[in-house]
């Protein structure tokens, strides 16, 4: 929780906080949800989810994590299904709000059959 | 293959605790959210808690809710359910589920259950 | 909160028969709802998500449609072991479970 001073009440601010590793494995034809929980105020304006610098149109879904007034905290999930070899890089969830931007990235290593990360 | 086997459960009194394991094998677990899910005798099913893959975060249902901590150890591939202050109507089968990938809330893969019955 | 309703509570059908099993939610839920199937001594099984879609593994015979506050979850033609209790699962505010539905043998 952000401390706020005096002159700063009318600030905003954007917290992100990542609810599986940042540095993921899988393997290759699995599945994963990368998750983030964020608090945001003003609320949030604009998510997006980005991989090798094109915009997720699908796959994700972002919701407030309580249908109360006050709510700031949100959550947004991107969902990664049946995943090969060559999707394996770096995902990015970005969102802004009328004060601030913020991002978080992870880091997806998927294993191909030949070769896999043992847990 | 996805095994969920849950222990832990048995017979407590009224205010007292008790702890819920499940031990996971046959997928990665720390990629995947967890929840349990309860079925009181002869009657239908109640989603209770579930906790993201990291143990960061989690949702529990109101009737639970201050009562009933869930928490993982995702070193040891294990789900938990701590359980305090426990009422009669809390007296069920507990079941660990999966959560599924790209449908948060749907379970996809089942344990076969504990039971906990609270009586004195 | 959101309430999900079945109907009918018990259904008697043969073998081979088709069986309709109906769900209402309390409001809109999108598309957000799943059924599970629970034979007598076993855990549930997920049978469909959103609406529409099987899970691994399960026959071609089950379907569903729906959307908005109003679903329904059709087996085609009834094998043995479909003979179970049918539960339908809304995903779009929490996580609530209908009440059930029985299919038992006629």
């Known amino acids: 929780q952000p401390s706020v001073s005096p002159g700063e009440v009318d600030k905003g601010f954007i917290n992100i906080f990542p609810m599986i590793n940042t540095t993921v494995f899988v393997n290759d034809g699995e599945n994963v949800d990368l998750i983030v929980e964020y608090e945001a105020f003003p609320k949030p304006e604009h998510q997006q989810w980005i991989y090798m610098n094109r915009t997720f149109t699908d796959k994700w879904e972002d919701y407030p994590k309580s249908e109360n007034e006050s709510n700031i905290r949100y959550v947004s999930e991107l969902h990664l299904t049946r995943l090969k070899g060559t999707e394996g890089g770096t995902y990015t969830f970005l969102v802004s709000n009328s004060d601030v931007n913020a991002a978080i990235a992870f880091n997806v290593y998927v294993n191909t059959k030949h070769h896999h990360h043992h847990h | 293959e996805v095994q969920l086997l849950e222990s832990g459960g048995g017979l407590v009194q009224p205010g007292g605790s008790l702890r819920l394991s499940c031990a996971a094998s046959?997928?990665?677990?720390?990629?995947?959210?967890m929840g349990w899910v309860r079925q009181a005798p002869g009657k239908g099913l109640e989603w209770v808690s579930w906790?993201?893959?990291?143990?960061?975060?989690?949702f529990q249902a109101d009737s639970v809710k201050g009562r009933f901590t869930i928490s993982r150890d995702n070193s040891k591939n294990t789900l938990y359910l701590q359980m305090n202050s426990l009422r009669a109507e809390d007296t069920a089968v507990y079941y660990c589920a999966r959560v599924r990938v790209g449908s948060t809330g749907n379970f996809d893969y089942w344990g076969q259950g504990t039971l906990v019955t609270v009586s004195s | 909160d959101i309430q999900m309703t079945q109907s009918p509570a018990t259904l008697s059908l043969s073998p081979g028969e088709r069986a309709t099993l109906y769900c209402r939610a309390s409001q809109s839920v999108s598309n957000y709802v799943a059924w599970y199937q629970q034979r007598p001594g076993q855990a549930p099984r997920l049978l469909m998500y959103?609406?529409?879609k099987r899970a691994t593994g399960i026959p071609a015979r089950f379907s569903g449609s729906g959307s908005g506050t109003d679903f329904t979850l059709t087996i085609s033609s009834l094998e043995p072991e479909d003979f179970a209790v049918y539960y339908c699962?809304?995903?779009?505010?929490?996580?609530?479970f209908g009440g059930g539905t029985k299919v038992e043998i006629k």
């Open positions: 906790i993201y893959p990291s143990g960061g975060g989690t």
């Open positions: 699962q809304q995903r779009s505010y929490w996580f609530a």
């Open positions: 046959g997928f990665t677990f720390s990629n995947y959210k």
């Open positions: 959103d609406t529409s």
